[in-house]
């Protein structure tokens, strides 16, 4: 969390941003909030990016003002217009690109004063893994697949019964480049698995950590997966 204050002028307002990550090819949110002001006509929101000449986005007098917008963001940005009045200056970024990563500034003017805060935005690819029993294998084998990751992640297997065990000798992980030549499909195979045990396939890079669990018993198979972004720090 980054909290910024206005530095010049008589009044300053608090502006708060949260560092976040964008999943390339999908829509992302650059989070920014400020002290609410009911007078919409006085609110100005400017999003700027370090190293970019034009604006990322500008909202003033109750509407988007995009005459100064940089070409790389053309047609890809929007604020939540109905939420501005309650202090939400967050930016929706469509079709996140790898090159969208960097330092952004959320700059706010209201009838109460001015303020700004910076935001670190990381970009990459992350997806939920799915763990299945590989019935085609000669021995009891689990197959963990996740369709899109970038940068290349690490894959670690764990088991509830054998806590702390190192499965690197009995697993094999491969990375297959996807058609857009950036993201990769992750496939990891775990051999010699035992029944009545819960196994976890953990995929992690510097942006996200995802886990796929599978519990195999004689009567049923239970699966669960979750994904966590690693750099959600507010400022």
């Amino acid at each position: 969390l980054i909290i910024g204050f206005g530095i010049s002028g008589r009044h300053s307002i608090t502006v708060t941003t949260v560092a976040s990550a964008g999943n390339i090819g999908e829509d992302g949110i650059l989070s920014c909030t400020f002290e609410p002001d009911i007078k919409l006509s006085d609110i100005v929101i400017q999003w700027l990016k370090e190293g970019v000449l034009g604006l990322v986005h500008e909202f003033k007098e109750g509407k988007d003002e995009l005459s100064e917008q940089d070409e790389m963001f053309r047609g890809r940005t929007a604020v939540f217009a109905d939420q501005v009045i309650v202090g939400n200056a967050s930016l929706r970024l469509k079709n996140v690109q790898l090159t969208d990563a960097g330092t952004y500034k959320c700059y706010i003017i209201t009838s109460k004063g001015k303020g700004n805060a910076n935001l670190e935005y990381k970009t990459g690819a992350f997806s939920m893994p799915e763990v299945n029993v590989d019935y085609n294998a000669s021995s009891e084998t689990l197959r963990c697949e996740a369709p899109r990751w970038f940068p290349q992640p690490t894959v670690v297997w764990a088991s509830q019964v054998d806590q702390g065990a190192n499965f690197s000798e009995v697993s094999n992980t491969s990375f297959e480049l996807n058609s857009e030549n950036v993201t990769m499909k992750v496939v990891s195979v775990l051999y010699n698995v035992t029944i009545n045990n819960t196994y976890s396939c953990m995929i992690e890079n510097d942006i996200a950590k995802a886990t796929g669990d599978i519990k195999v018993t004689e009567s049923e198979i239970k699966r669960r997966s979750h994904l966590q972004l690693l750099n959600s720090k507010a400022s």
């Epitope: 007078k39 919409l40 109750g62 509407k63 217009a81 309650v86 939400n88």
Partner: antibody, heavy 117, light 107 residues
Framework: QLQLQESGPGLVKPSETLSLTCTVS??????????WSWIRQPPGKGLEWIGS???????YYNPSLKSRVTISVDTSKNQFSLKLSSVTAADTAVYYC?????????WGQGTMVIVSS | DIQMTQSPSSLSASVGDRVTITCRAS??????LNWYQQKPGKAPKLLIY???SLQSGVPSRFSGSGSGTDFTLTISSLQPEDFATYYC?????????FGGGTKVEIK
């Protein structure tokens, strides 16, 4: 779902202070940023915004009523209140409380207040 | 204050009719225009916000358009339950102000 309920006396004497409370149920008044608002409607007439409050305590009043209005919030009771001083017969109306972002999306049922001696 | 002028103040229509109500602001309010429906003895109900966004649960026969100073509420095919009074409201600048209302009556 979220519900708002106005309460207070239905009859107020001229020159006295009108006091109403809005109780929020089905959700916390401080769970998100909203303008907790008061609107009134004289019999057979249109709607008039009285004012709004944020849980931070920031208040916004209609300039036509500003000198007579106080809106306050009590997060511990999940309530916000309206006080309108020095009332006259012109303040006779149905008083509504409502939740707003840039639109008033949840309203109380309204309470009729008559100013009469 | 921003004045909101609604027209007509009343209209008579039949079930199935297409009904249009207009609202004009005394200055530009961007798209910060909301529409409400009120039935006798009841609180207003939000229909349209941000000039054209349909509030959740509101039938799709209701639609809104416009920006700046001129706005329209359209009911594509009037239903028996639509006979009510309709108000526009701006939230661009305080004080928030409402139009005078349009009463839709049965012909």
């Amino acid at each position: 779902q979220l519900q708002l309920q106005e309460s207070g006396p239905g009859l107020v004497k001229p020159s006295e202070t009108l006091s109403l409370t809005c109780t929020v149920s089905g959700g916390s008044i401080s769970s998100s940023v909203y303008y907790w608002s008061w609107i009134r409607q004289p019999p057979g007439k249109g709607l008039e915004w009285i004012g709004s409050i944020l849980v931070s305590g920031s208040t916004y009043y209609n300039p036509s009523l500003k000198s007579r209005v106080t809106i306050s919030v009590d997060t511990s009771k999940n309530q916000f209140s309206l006080k309108l001083s020095s009332v006259t017969a012109a303040d006779t109306a149905v008083y509504y409380c409502a939740r707003a972002v840039s639109f008033l999306d949840v309203w109380g049922q309204g309470t009729m207040v008559i100013v009469s001696s | 204050d921003i004045q909101m002028t609604q027209s007509p103040s009343s209209l008579s229509a039949s079930v199935g009719d297409r009904v249009t109500i207009t609202c004009r602001a005394s200055q530009s309010i961007s798209s910060y225009l909301n529409w409400y429906q009120q039935k006798p003895g009841k609180a207003p109900k939000l229909l349209i916000y941000g000039a054209s966004s349909l509030q959740s649960g509101v039938p799709s026969r209701f639609s809104g358009s416009g920006s700046g100073t001129d706005f329209t509420l359209t009911i594509s095919s009037l239903q028996p339950e639509d006979f009510a009074t309709y108000y526009c409201q701006q939230s661009y600048d305080p004080p928030w102000t409402f139009g005078g209302g349009t009463k839709v009556e049965i012909k």
